[in-house]
């Protein structure tokens, strides 16, 4: 029932997971200098009956260089801030979708944990996307992919999000102007931005619903 | 199942303007965006824009910049392609495509410009 | 732009040989790469997605490799109907430009 893939990559785009289904797991990874501690947890596993889901086994990591197990403790935010994990963090999860059943939260962070989170999904997982900082969506199709099993295989679905760091003429609605694209951009720039003003109540709701679900953009 | 239906073939003179036409059907047409590509007789594939079906929005690419113009009818599920100021260059077929990964082409549609 | 180079141009093979088509990318396009089958006067038909992605309702003897600049499609086992062109392709940023395309004949 685990996902043999990662979800797919989208350029100039990252994801995540609002809730983990059932049976997803979270490597215990420290950062640099540290480790997991001897007795220490491999990965958290989200687990659960119809009504609750939780992360069972805790993560801890201890300093390399000693032989000490560190108490489980919030980081502070400054601490919390080179946190950088392949799954967008969002500090707001959207009430509908953490409180799925058969669904986890994300995990609390632990300490001296690892800048990026290692995952391993589960078929029915479902990831959302958003374009990074620079770049805005050309084409907002459905922005999300679901690990899906086929004829005894699992894929994921391809999300349907064009980002672009093309100059503009017009915006989308509650859309801001983009930034320079962080990668910059070559003088002899090889396609044009063209823009109309036909847009639709369903991009206002695409842009409102994206504002809802990632309320802290991670490049 | 997934269909994407182009017009007939065109002959044009030089100088003038043709407008191609690609119905999408089986699917929900503002989910995916549309590309346009084309080959010339005896070459390659050459991209030439994609358009947004749900806002309208088009990159097209530096060589076609100025001559083009892709829009799009949501009511009819259909996508077009208009390319002007023809030259017998322009010889070709030109095909659309679906989505991200240009998982679905139309048929083609062969323009000839001919004086 | 970003250039893509196919080779070989041409290829000569027979049923039930393997056969590698290789694309490079002149820069960094990570997994960002698709292959396309043309068939004389038919439209092209995606093979291959996301550099490793079989597409829907292709055989298994077609598969995908590669990250960055450098990619490989490999067909298994020749079957009589994969005599064609192949194209790369990559979506990393516009223009999405192809590779000039691989010609697989019969030997």
């Known amino acids: 029932e685990l996902c043999d893939d990662d979800p797919p990559e989208i350029p100039h785009a990252t994801f995540k997971a609002m809730a983990y289904k059932e049976g997803t797991m979270l490597n215990c990874e420290c950062k640099r200098g540290f480790r997991r501690i001897k007795s220490g947890s491999l990965y958290m596993l989200c687990t659960g009956n119809s009504s609750h889901s939780s992360w069972d086994n805790q993560c801890q990591c201890t300093s390399s260089a000693t032989r000490n197990t560190t108490k489980q403790v919030t980081p502070q935010p400054e601490e919390q801030k080179e946190r950088k994990t392949t799954e967008m963090q969002s500090p707001m999860q959207p009430v509908d979708q953490a409180s799925l059943p058969g669904h986890c939260r994300e995990p609390p962070p632990w300490e001296n944990e690892a800048t990026e989170r290692i995952y391993h999904f589960v078929v029915g997982q479902m990831v959302y996307y958003q374009c990074v900082q620079g770049y805005r969506a050309l084409h907002r199709g459905p922005a999300e992919s679901v690990c899906k099993m086929t004829h005894g295989k699992t894929r994921w679905t391809q999300p349907q999000l064009i980002c672009t760091g093309e100059m503009e003429t017009s915006q989308f609605p509650g859309e801001e102007k983009p930034q320079a694209s962080p990668e910059g951009r070559p003088e002899s720039e090889t396609s044009c931005l063209v823009t109309t003003t036909d847009f639709q109540i369903q991009t206002e709701m695409a842009a409102t619903m994206e504002t809802s679900i990632f309320t802290t953009e991670y490049q | 199942q997934v269909q994407l239906v182009q017009s007939g073939a065109e002959v044009k003179k030089p100088g003038a303007s043709v407008k191609v036409s690609c119905k999408g059907s089986?699917?929900?047409?503002?989910?995916?965006?549309m590309h346009w590509v084309r080959q010339a007789p005896g070459q390659g594939l050459e991209w030439m824009g994609v358009?947004?079906?749900?806002?309208?929005?088009?990159i097209y690419a530096q060589k076609f910049q100025g001559r083009v113009t892709m829009t799009v009818d949501k009511s009819t599920s259909t996508a077009y392609m208009e390319l002007s100021s023809l030259r017998s260059e322009d010889t070709a077929v030109y095909y659309c495509?679906?989505?991200?990964?240009?998982?679905?082409w139309g048929q083609g549609t062969t323009v000839t410009v001919s004086s | 732009d970003i250039q893509m180079t196919q080779s070989p141009s041409s290829l000569s093979a027979s049923v039930g040989d393997r056969v590698t088509i290789t694309c490079r990318a002149s820069q960094d396009i990570s997994n960002y790469l698709e292959w396309y089958q043309q068939k004389p006067g038919k439209a092209p038909k995606l093979l291959i997605y996301?550099?490793?992605t079989l597409a829907e309702g292709v055989p298994s003897r077609f598969s995908g490799s590669g990250s960055g600049t450098d990619f490989t499609l490999t067909i298994s086992s020749l079957q009589p109907e994969d005599f064609a062109t192949y194209y790369c392709?990559?979506?990393?940023?516009?223009?999405?430009?192809f590779g000039q395309g691989t010609k697989l004949e019969i030997k």
């Open positions: 358009i947004s079906t749900y806002s309208g929005d088009a």
């Open positions: 089986g699917y929900t047409f503002t989910d995916y965006a």
């Open positions: 996301n550099a490793k």
């Open positions: 495509a679906r989505g991200v990964t240009f998982d679905y």
């Open positions: 392709q990559h979506h990393y940023d516009t223009p999405y430009t």
